[in-house]
Interface confidence: low
């Protein structure tokens, strides 16, 4: 018996061929011997089966001795043995219809679980193997779960259902709702304006929800909420903002925050959370602020940084073309009795300059000037 696999919602064509290459009488029946369709001369006739409005054939092929049964909008319950009666012959075709669906929604938050459920006809024992957009293979039976979805899991999942050495392939588009970056870091000199941007890694027609930026300043013992906002159809409106610092927020996506001045007391880490309407859980993006200050007090020239720096960062203070004073472990570097000239404070990581600040040291009888 020939086995054909079909996909729920799709169209399947079951073939039936006569030895005579001409239009002759044929009938398609199901396993209960109920007629589905057949012909009377050149007319298509239909029986009382449940498939009535979804069954068809191709009259253009009858003259060649081909009498296909076409079933549209397949349902799991269409799984059955179909019998084609032609020329006193009976051709049996077993049709197995499978469906594969994602749990609740194909738009999932980063970190959530994706469950794919296989609908299969009674008596079948299929195996499923799914390949994620990043090439990982996951296998299972009737249900298949992937925990902790990552941004890279966004895209088309290709799932192959295997039954009786036959395969049917499903493609499911999954959108992982996340910020483009899990974390970002901004380096600023004291007094400069700071721009924080939180671009989303997905696009949807309507986006509604609410968000908040919590900030843990390096110098503070506890974190505090700097701003809360609402999002309605991609329009941003501020609900509440602290007085110090007074953040400004852009009215359109991507989410954009401006801190008027980078000050040492603001250096630290923030966590922006976004709760989307009709979704459980929140999107998160970490943002870090590093602030540099170069000062001269009496006979001491100091360069300091505040905020989350990695162990690979290097802080240096140098006078034009002279040897630099470097600190790898401390977040401050200083020179006593500095020579007159333009001093440069540099924060670098593996040779790449992240932040620089210049300070002019005047001869000892003058006061310093900061450009």
């Amino acid at each position: 018996k020939k086995v054909v696999l079909g996909k729920k919602g799709d169209t399947v064509e079951l073939t039936c061929t006569a030895s005579q290459k001409k239009s002759i009488q044929f009938h398609w029946k199901n396993s209960n011997q109920i007629k589905i369709l057949g012909n009377q001369g050149s007319f298509l006739t239909k029986g009382p089966s449940k498939l009535n409005d979804r069954a068809d054939s191709r009259r253009s092929l009858w003259d060649q001795g081909n009498f296909p049964l076409i079933i549209k909008n397949l349902k799991i319950e269409d799984s059955d043995t179909y019998i084609c009666e032609v020329e006193d012959q009976k051709e049996e075709v077993q049709l197995l219809v499978f469906g594969l669906t994602a749990n609740s929604d194909t738009h999932l938050l980063q970190g959530q679980s994706l469950t794919l459920t296989l609908e299969s006809p009674p008596g079948s024992s299929p195996s499923v193997q799914c390949r994620s957009p990043r090439g990982k293979n996951i296998q299972g039976g009737k249900t298949l779960s992937v925990s902790q979805l990552e941004l890279q899991d966004s895209g088309t999942w290709t799932c192959t259902v295997l039954q009786n050495q036959k395969k049917v392939e499903f493609k499911i588009d999954i959108v992982v709702l996340a910020f483009q970056k899990a974390s970002s870091i901004v380096y600023k000199k004291e007094g400069e304006q700071v721009e924080f941007s939180f671009p989303l890694a997905f696009t949807v027609e309507k986006l509604t929800g609410s968000g908040e930026l919590w900030w843990q300043a390096e110098r503070a013992s506890s974190s505090k909420s700097w701003i809360t906002f609402d999002l309605k159809n991609k329009e941003v409106s501020v609900k509440r903002v602290t007085q110090d610092p007074k953040l400004q927020m852009g009215k359109k996506l991507p989410l954009h925050l401006t801190l008027p001045q980078a000050l040492p007391q603001y250096a630290g880490s923030g966590n922006l959370t976004l709760a989307l309407e009709a979704k459980t859980g929140k999107l998160h993006q970490e943002v870090n602020l590093v602030v540099m200050r170069a000062t001269q007090l009496q006979k001491n020239l100091t360069c300091e940084v505040w905020g989350p720096t990695s162990p690979k960062l290097m802080l240096s203070l140098k006078l034009e073309n002279k040897e630099a004073k470097v600190s790898k472990r401390e977040k401050a570097v200083w020179v006593l009795n500095p020579e007159a000239g333009m001093w440069q404070c540099l924060l670098s990581d593996s040779g790449q300059v992240l932040l620089e600040s210049n300070i002019k040291v005047l001869p000892t009888w003058s006061t310093p000037v900061q450009p």
Epitope: R134, G135, N137, I138, Q139, S145, V146, S147, Q148, Q152
Partner: antibody, heavy 120, light 113 residues
């Protein structure tokens, strides 16, 4: 620092099954998958499959499909690889390994290896 | 499956000299979405598990001496040891992790001439 410690050597008869364990310690929250790789005497490295110690999700090499089962016990941070219907060509050192850096499936942490000998 | 082919199978190099091992994949292991090559190099000494030297084709694992370097993209890759030391005698393997099944090269045995 993550460490992987494997169970001791095994000697099995053809047709039997073997179950090798791999216990993870130190920063196991960084582990998203533990992979099994085997090496027959004097031969190269061969990937067997992987298991996610948190979810239990698995992915097996087609070659071992139907003969290998990978499981985990979250309470002891241990994963297991069971290979059934053993044959002489399954004689090998079986390693568990895991990536802990951002390098996806480039394995920077390896177990010491478990020698499995299949002999009648 | 992606087939990894290393050349040569064995190599003898004098101490202090440069050693070069090649690895070819049957299909590209460059991910356009990450713009990274999913390729790693390992060193294995007798009785020991493999040791990761290089990942993303050219990123050196921490603690690996800088005489080891990886290069190449797409299907052709090279591991270079700029100045061979006695402790570098081992078998070297390349590995792709672009897609399952993960596959390794057959190995290159490096000896001192």
């Amino acid at each position: 620092q993550v460490q992987l410690v494997q169970s001791g050597a095994e000697v099995k008869k053809p047709g039997a099954s073997v179950k090798v364990s791999c216990k993870a310690s130190g920063g196991t929250q960084n582990i998203y998958a533990i992979t099994w790789v085997r090496q027959a005497p004097g031969q190269g490295l061969e990937w067997v499959g992987w298991v996610n110690p948190n979810s239990g999700n698995t992915g097996y090499s087609q070659k071992f499909q139907g003969r290998v089962t990978m499981t985990r016990d979250t309470s002891t941070s241990t994963v297991y690889m069971e290979l059934s219907s053993l044959r002489s060509e399954d004689t090998a050192v079986y390693y568990c390994a895991t990536p802990t850096s951002s390098s996806d499936d480039a394995f920077d942490i390896w177990g010491q290896g478990t020698t499995v000998t299949v002999s009648s | 499956d992606i087939v990894m082919t290393q050349s040569p199978d064995s190599l003898a190099v004098s101490l202090g000299e440069r050693a070069t091992i090649n690895c070819k994949s049957s299909q590209s292991v460059l991910s356009s979405s990450y713009n990274k090559n999913f390729l790693a190099w390992y060193q294995q000494k007798p009785g020991q598990p493999p040791k990761l030297l290089i990942y993303w084709a050219s990123t050196r694992e921490s603690g690996v001496p800088d005489r080891f370097s990886g290069s190449g993209s797409g299907t052709d890759f090279t591991l270079t040891i700029s100045s061979l030391q006695a402790e570098d005698v081992a078998v070297y393997y390349c590995q792709q992790y672009y897609s399952d099944p993960i596959t390794f090269g057959q190995g290159t045995k490096l000896e001192i001439k």
